[in-house]
Amino acid sequence: LRLLDHRALVCSQPGLNCTVKNSTCLDDSWIHPRNLTPSSPKDLQIQLHFAHTQQGDLFPVAHIEWTLQTDASILYLEGAELSVLQLNTNERLCVRFEFLSKLRHHHRRWRFTFSHFVVDPDQEYEVTVHHLPKPIPDGDPNHQSKNFLVPDCEHARMKVTTPCMSSGSLWDPNITVETLEAHQLRVSFTLWNESTHYQILLTSFPHMENHSCFEHMHHIPAPRPEEFHQRSNVTLTLRNLKGCCRHQVQIQPFFSSCLNDCLRHSATVSCPEMPDTPEPIPDYMPLW
C-alpha cells in the first residue's frame, strides 16, 4: 500500500484551511479521549479512478468521498483519519486531514475527497473514514467503512494500467488445445514479443472430480526474435488412465517485468460426451 505522488496532497477548500498528514493509524484521541466528539461521516463513496504518476505510469487509485452531517457536532470536528486496510495481508495505510480552521455551516453540505491511495488489481480493501477526535470508549461510533474490491487484470480498463502491463496483461496467447489419437494433446499458443521461456502445466482430472489424476510440466525455450507473435505448437503425451479425461492446460510466461509472477492463461478440455449405452438386446428370444 502506498500513496500516489505524495507531494500533491491537498484538502483545503473555500472556507476551510486543511492539511494532509501521514498518520500512524492511531490518533491521539484514542489515548486521550475528548468529552465532545463529532458525528460520523455521511454517504461514504468509494470509486475506482486511474491516475498518472509524474513518470507517466498509470495506476488504479481508490477515490474516497464523503459528506458531513448537518448537525452542530461540526463545531467539534478537528479533522478526519482515512484508513485503507488490504484484507489479504492486513497491511494498513492511513492519512489524516487536519483542519487548521473551525468549520462553519454554510449554504451547501461540506464534502471531502481523497484520491491518492494506490490499489492493486484483484485485491480487496476495507476503506474507513473516521472523524476526529474519535469517540470516548462507550460513545457512538463516528466512522464509516466499506469493503472495496478492485477488478483483476482481465478487466478491459485495468489491463492497460502499469501494474497489469508489468505482469503481462497485454499478452493474449489465444490458446487452443485439441485431443489427438494415442493419448496426446496438441497445445498451440501465440508467443509474446520477448525472448523469454514459457512453461506449460498440464493437470488432468477424472470426469466429475477435482483431485488430479495426472500432472505434467513442459518447458518451452525462449523464442528467437523472428518467432515473436508466431504460434508455438507442442504435443503432450497423456497418461493412459481410463477416465482421466478432463485436461487443464496452463501457460506460464517468464517475462522480464514479472519473472515468475506473471499472469497465467489457461484452457480446459472437457471429457468426451458418453453416449447412453442401451441395454443389450439378445439375438434370439427363448420361446418358453
Epitope: 454517504d43 461514504l44 463513496q45 468509494i46 470509486q47 475506482l48 479512478h49 481508490a62 477515490h63 480487496e124 466499506k146 469493503n147 472495496f148 474490491l149 478492485v150 477488478p151 483483476d152 482481465e154 478487466h155 478491459a156 480498463r157 485495468m158
Partner: nanobody, 127 residues
Amino acid sequence: QVQLVESGGGLVQPGRSLRLSCAASGFSFDDYAMHWVRQAPGKGLEWVSGITWNSGRKDYADSVKGRFTISRDNAKNSLYLQMNSLRSEDTALYYCVKERSLGYCRGGTCSEPFHIWGQGTMVTVSS
C-alpha cells in the same frame, strides 16, 4: 443514456420461485459490478445481492442467503435474480442498480445514494 429495465415480478405463493431480469443499455455493461436492492412497502431500501463484472464474486444479504442466486450474462447485457423458497417478507419492489465506478463493494454498493437504477419490478409473496 444509461437505462435499466427490470422485469419478472408478480404475485407468487410462499415457497415458490421467481426469476427477475434486468436489461441494461447505454453503458459498457461488462465493465461494471451490479446489485439488486429492494424496498418493502413503507420501508427503506435494503441491499439484496451484488455481483462483480465477471461474476467472479457474488454476495448476499443474510436474509436471502441460500435462497436467492444472482447471475449475469454479459453477452446479453442482462442481470438476473433467481428467487427460491419465497417468503412473505420478500414482498417488495426490486431494483437493479449499476455501480458508479469499476470497483465492487461487499454488502452494499460503493456509492450511496444509489447511482443508476431502474423503475423496479414488484414481487408480492402471498397465499
